[in-house]
Amino acid sequence: EKPVYELQVQKSVTVQEGLCVLVPCSFSYPWRSWYSSPPLYVYWFRDGEIPYYAEVVATNNPDRRVKPETQGRFRLLGDVQKKNCSLSIGDARMEDTGSYFFRVERGRDVKYSYQQNKLNLEVTALIEKPDIHFLEPLESGRPTRLSCSLPGSCEAGPPLTFSWTGNALSPLDPETTRSSELTLTPRPEDHGTNLTCQMKRQGAQVTTERTVQLNVSYAPQTITIFRNGIALEILQNTSYLPVLEGQALRLLCDAPSNPPAHLSWFQGSPALNATPISNTGILELRRVRSAEEGGFTCRAQHPLGFLQIFLNLSVYSLPQLLGPSCSWEAEGLHCRCSFRARPAPSLCWRLEEKPLEGNSSQGSFKVNSSSAGPWANSSLILHGGLSSDLKVSCKAWNIYGSQSGSVLLLQGRSNLGTGVVPAAL
């Protein structure tokens, strides 16, 4: 039978710098079992080198010198006795690029270089990025283990060094962030921030990194109510809002959370199963009425919990004044003033710009006040005739504003008659 030297190996292989590759390989050579059994030695050489003198890149012969630059990185993998010549290349370097040939030696008769089946190795720039693994979803306050690994990397060559960076890692000590694994307890403010794992071979210039954006689930921490872009002050889960009667009001309730909380508005202080008056974060009142005084609640419902804020709406109105109007009656000059306001206003009468307070000790005037519904009435009785032309004014005010009206009373009751003199506002 004709002796056969055969090698099955791929013609070319490409690997990224710093990564590993396994090149499958099998060979055959002529051998008879009745031969003596000297050891089988196999070698991988750089193309163009002379087997008798050159340093090998990989061998199973302990007596042959291996190139220092490939030592530990180029390794024979598999059982050569089973004619397996597979070559493992780790921590590939740019200078590894080139052709390699395989050689077999056994005793005096088998010495053969497979020059017709060369392996072409090309080392390219590293574009592979590490993978960051963790169990999703990340939940605020719940510790999570993260690991960083580079697909295609292996133990060969100098060790990999890791570094983690990101706002979420601020409290961690430097030692923790140099491991391939770390435990992170995310906070709400870490949502949307970047976390980067960088890998580097010790002593090499090759670095690669992967950045992920953290998706942190968190329940609402705060609720803010905005009135047309302005945040209302909130004290002990309650916000107070004075609104002018008749004014339009648009309130936006916002509770930052992830995923977004379901926001709804309720009238008053609702039970958990109450029906909302708005199923969005927006409460719109086209014309605020005094009947709406009281409360609204904004509730933020989230799988991780809920929050609610009570909005105490106080409806105010500027004083509206009717009067004064005056007429002569049996007991003297009778002037009336009607007014309406929220909160209830104070009222004073003036005679010639001088305030009339209470009832006069001399009995020259008397003030009476009463209220009916939203309106309050005050009357002034001036006893006796007028000695000169007089200006009578009434003024109503509350903390939001004031309004006054006046009437000019001409001397002599005949001039005034018994008619009503409308206020000159």
């Epitope: 905005f226 009135r227 047309n228 872009g229 302005i230 945040a231 004014q247 339009a248 509770a255 086209r286």
Partner: antibody, heavy 121, light 107 residues
Amino acid sequence: QAYLQQSGAELVKPGASVKLSCKASGYIFTEYTIHWVKQRSGQGLEWIGWFYPGSGSIKYNEKFKDKATLTADKSSSTVYMELSRLTSEDSAVYFCATHERAAQAAWSAYWGQGTLVTVSA
Amino acid sequence: DVQMNQSPASLSASVGETVTITCRASGNIHNYLAWYQQKQGKSPQLLVYNAKTLTDGVPSRFSGSGSGTQYSLKINTLQPEDFGSYYCQHFWSTPYTFGGGTKLEMK
């Protein structure tokens, strides 16, 4: 009185990102909403969105939702706006603005001096 | 979204004249309207808010009026420093859109 100091002019390449800052002083930073407004050369004003440092609430104009990202650093009383995937359409002056505390709505009473962003290859 | 339609886009006037700029909203904005003045190369300045309230320090020759969807800014007896661009902005609901602006130039 509120005072807003914006970062300096930026020249950036198409496709890149830029982060503008607006440093607030003269008031309690967490109590006021800060608005961002865009103005292209010789054009009108466009409202981008607001950031409320008190709770981290953000409201975007839908038009800018994928373009602008608003964040803040409470320790330095600074609000940031990051603009991503820049194109020539993003070349503009960007203003930050805030309001009076007692206002009924966020009328922009105080404005930063503006930051000019130029996107060019 | 509420759109703001501002007119005219440009306006030429002389010192001493009276001018009116209008803004029409696509929906009722309930007086939540502001007017700003902007000079070339400067930041806008708030003139009027709540549709008709003048900001402190703004001369009384400026006045705002309107309700519902129609609003206007009137400048009586124009002064040299009044020339520039004017913008309205609503604050009823987000987005808080601006009008297209009015460029007031000296005739």
